[in-house]
């Protein structure tokens, strides 16, 4: 969702969204200078009136956090940036239509990997988003995407991997060799919207087998 550049003052006005945190970004063109300032407006799709984003008026940085203004993940939004440089006319560029549900990317999950003697347990922690429920609770990714599931891989060596997947938050890879290092990777997938996070990676070593010492 990037607009075509026709001016040397402003280009690449687009939303960058991750886990429903929606940041408007842009680049200054070759004609922009250090005194170029930018102002941001936004609106819901279907509405006429543009709203000025407080805190993003006549700014010099090339980003603006519109998470709160675009927080309804079932709606579509537009944003536009107006660039003004000394002695020149203002240049305005608008984003393509933006939907956080469609366009947001998913960050790697937060996972705790717990080594045991012959197994490794992986606990996936729910990912909070800025999206609020009607009663003001922050929603997790699991509460937004019905089809969200986790794919876990345990690299035993260069040639062998173990796989688990599901919608649960607790997993355990069993039958491992004690006192051995393993590489785990955990990815979030949402099939309907074809989203896949980068993996969370943990390197863990199973605990040594001390039972012989007591026999």
């Amino acid at each position: 969702h990037t607009t075509v550049d026709t001016s040397g003052l402003l280009q690449h006005v687009k939303f960058q969204s991750s886990n429903f945190e929606n940041i408007l970004t842009w680049d200054g063109g070759p004609a922009s200078t250090s005194d170029t300032v930018y102002s941001v407006e936004y609106k819901k799709y279907g509405e006429r009136k543009w709203l000025a984003k407080a805190g993003c008026q006549r700014i010099t940085q090339k980003f603006c956090n519109l998470t709160m203004e675009t927080r309804n993940h079932t709606e579509f939004y537009y944003a536009k940036v107006t660039a003004v440089s000394a002695g020149g006319p203002p240049v305005t560029k608008m984003t393509d239509r933006f939907s956080s549900l469609q366009h947001t990317t998913i960050k790697p999950p937060d996972v705790t990997c717990i080594p045991k003697v012959r197994s490794i347990q992986m606990l996936v922690h729910p990912t909070l988003t800025p999206v609020l429920s009607e009663d003001g609770h922050q929603l997790t990714l699991e509460e937004i995407f019905h089809d969200l599931f986790y794919r876990l891989e345990l690299h035993v060596n260069h040639t062998y991997q173990m796989h688990l997947e599901g919608k649960q938050r607790e997993y355990e890879f069993l039958g491992l060799t004690p006192d051995t290092e393993f590489l785990g990777s955990i990815t979030i997938l949402t099939p309907i919207l074809s989203k896949e996070s980068a993996p969370y990676v943990c390197r863990v070593k199973t605990l040594p087998d001390r039972t012989w010492a007591y026999s």
Epitope: E134, E143, L164, Q168, P191
Partner: antibody, heavy 117, light 107 residues
């Protein structure tokens, strides 16, 4: 202990309406995915609708879109299915079910809905 | 929608027999498949999830395998209490869809 108890089924004429309820207990109702699943006489199982009780996000199977509405009353731990413009092919046992720890493992006993003139 | 094709639709088994039921998905569902058992007048009961993982409390004579589009439920030695209808369920994307069911009867 998880319990789901459906009610509200009955005999209704084609074009009529019915509201099913499912009283839930034994788990955190206000943060769960809740389902309505139906089974026509002598037939297989079909997922009808799902709602997340916290986000309010809903999905429907194509055959009931625009006619059925799933909703919840989180204060009363109750799931609803409002069924309008009922057709004879909606005749079935309607079950509510929930996903706990990632698994759809708990079901109610079902309530019979018969659409007939 | 993802179609689940289950076979056979019914089968007759003697007690102690090894029984195999297959389920084919119209597209890849990874390992997002569950198997349910349903007896007349009762709600379905979860047996297997994640294609091959046995639900707590389910006898070990039940096992599941497969991934992608092809899945199998095996009962290693049928007991009288296993006579029921079995359904596969894809839990990959909405609408979740069941196979048509396989009725296991006594020979």
């Amino acid at each position: 202990e998880v319990q789901l108890v459906e009610s509200g089924g009955g005999l209704v004429q084609p074009g009529g309406s019915l509201r099913l309820s499912c009283a839930a207990s034994g788990f955190t109702f206000s943060s769960s995915w809740m389902y309505w699943v139906r089974q026509a006489p002598g037939k297989g199982l079909e997922f009808v609708s799902v709602i997340n009780t916290r986000s309010g996000i809903t999905h429907y199977v194509e055959s009931v879109k625009g006619r059925f509405t799933i909703s919840t009353d989180n204060a009363k731990n109750t799931l609803f299915l409002q069924m309008n413009s009922l057709k004879s092919e909606d005749t079935a046992v309607y079950y509510c079910a929930t996903r706990i720890q990632g698994l759809i493992d708990y079901w109610g006993q079902g309530t019979q809905v018969t659409v007939s003139s | 929608d993802i179609q689940m094709t289950q076979s056979p639709s019914s089968l007759s088994a003697s007690l102690g027999d090894r029984v195999t039921i297959t389920c084919q998905a119209s597209q890849s569902i990874s390992s997002q498949l569950a198997w349910y058992q349903q007896k007349p007048g009762q709600a379905p009961k979860l047996l297997i999830y994640g294609a091959s993982r046995l639900q707590t409390g389910v006898p070990s004579r039940f096992s599941g395998s497969g991934s992608g589009t092809s899945f199998t439920l095996t009962i290693s030695g049928v007991e009288a209490e296993d006579l029921a209808t079995y359904y596969c369920l894809q839990d990959y994307s909405w609408p979740l869809t069941f196979g048509q069911g396989t009725k296991v009867e006594l020979k």
